[in-house]
Amino acid sequence: VPPGEDSKDVAAPHRQPLTSSERIDKQIRYILDGISALRKETCNKSNMCESSKEALAENNLNLPKMAEKDGCFQSGFNEETCLVKIITGLLEFEVYLEYLQNRFESSEEQARAVQMSTKVLIQFLQKKAKNLDAITTPDPTTNASLLTKLQAQNQWLQDMTTHLILRSFKEFLQSSLRALRQM
């Protein structure tokens, strides 16, 4: 159940409504729990999680990654720059989350929930951001051709891609969570 739709919340009218920051925090944690479940299926199905060949495959994927210049780390922390990076990064991850949709057997609903919850998270964050002009939206045509290319890979590369997307998305969200808690 996504945050805010918990039956316990409904049954507790005396509870203070969540602030914008608390809602974002809860949303990220919900997505991370979903990623954790998807990673379990991926790691059980193949030995990708222990593979040393992942760096090789990583070079061909342009997955969003936090760097010091993005202002999200403790050193050089910059709230506005960081928020732009988080939103831009999440928008860039959307195509990869679309790719994940047909990659799971027992966790198909979980993959859908991660995708939909990420869309909601982006909306929450866009409301928080002051400088929306700095946020670049990925080109739909580029995304479509990237998706086709990823889906045309052989089985081993598709498994590796799935593993790398989940690992990178988890890492990106964790960095985002830490940074947002500083704001």
């Epitope: 991370l32 729990d33 990654k65 988890k170 890492e171 964790q174 830490r178 808690r181």
Partner: antibody
């Protein structure tokens, strides 16, 4: 089984430097956040610094910021703490710890601790 | 910085007693609080994480509760092996911070 073994401690003069190492085994080191915690003689625990798995993201206590540098070598399964401009108040046992983060994605908690290495800053 | 106030700093109890230690944060830390036990001459041991989740292998007489700014560690039925110093840790926002510690002694 999980093992964390610290080394590199010793006696150093104020203003001097030391580099602590922590050799990790028994788990996939690269998947976990790692943290240094210290404890001065007869005092409580103090969080010193954390380093996250793949992002290169680091964080420091105000008391060591600008003097200490945390780093990791995932290929060697080793965590480091470079300590410069040491002061007498840095005298403590330094513990290397593993964060639950590899399993429980959003919760901070240190589930494994090394035996600690003694750092004494004195003239 | 988020400050943690742990109380009491020490307490004396009899074996079998229920013991309660509190940790107060200066601002909300959600459920990002963990509890540790340290016996003299030993390394600290994780008891509770996420405010209320019992770490594997920890006896069920230990329990944690709270969220936001107020947290509690309870030992239901103190045993001799529980005599130690207990610390809370906030892992919500940098710089992370331990409480000052609570020493549990025998009355």
């Amino acid at each position: 089984q999980v093992q964390l073994v610290e080394s590199g401690g010793g006696l150093v003069q104020p203003g001097g430097s030391l580099r602590l190492s922590c050799a990790a085994s028994g788990f996939t080191f690269s998947n976990y956040y790692m943290t240094w915690v210290r404890q001065a003689p007869g005092k409580g625990l103090e969080w010193v610094s954390s380093i996250y798995s793949f992002s290169g993201d680091t964080a420091y206590a105000d008391s060591v910021k600008g003097r200490f540098t945390i780093s990791r070598d995932n290929a060697k399964n080793t965590l480091y703490l470079q300590m410069n401009s040491l002061k007498s108040e840095d005298t403590a046992v330094y513990y290397c710890t593993r964060n639950l983060g590899g399993v429980v994605v959003t919760t901070n908690g240190y589930d494994y601790w090394g035996q600690g290495t003694q750092v004494t800053v004195s003239s | 910085d988020i400050q943690l106030t742990q109380s009491p700093s020490s307490l004396s109890a009899s074996l079998g007693d229920s013991v309660t230690i509190t940790c107060q944060a200066s601002q909300s830390i959600s459920d990002e609080l963990s509890w540790y036990q340290q016996k003299p001459g030993q390394t600290p041991k994780l008891l509770i994480y996420g405010a209320s989740k019992l770490q594997t292998g920890v006896p069920s007489r230990f329990s944690g509760s709270g969220s936001g700014t107020s947290f509690t560690l309870t030992i239901s039925g103190l045993e001799a092996e529980d005599l130690a110093t207990y610390y809370c840790l906030q892992g919500y926002r940098w710089p992370f911070m331990f409480g000052q510690g609570t020493k549990v002694e025998l009355k």
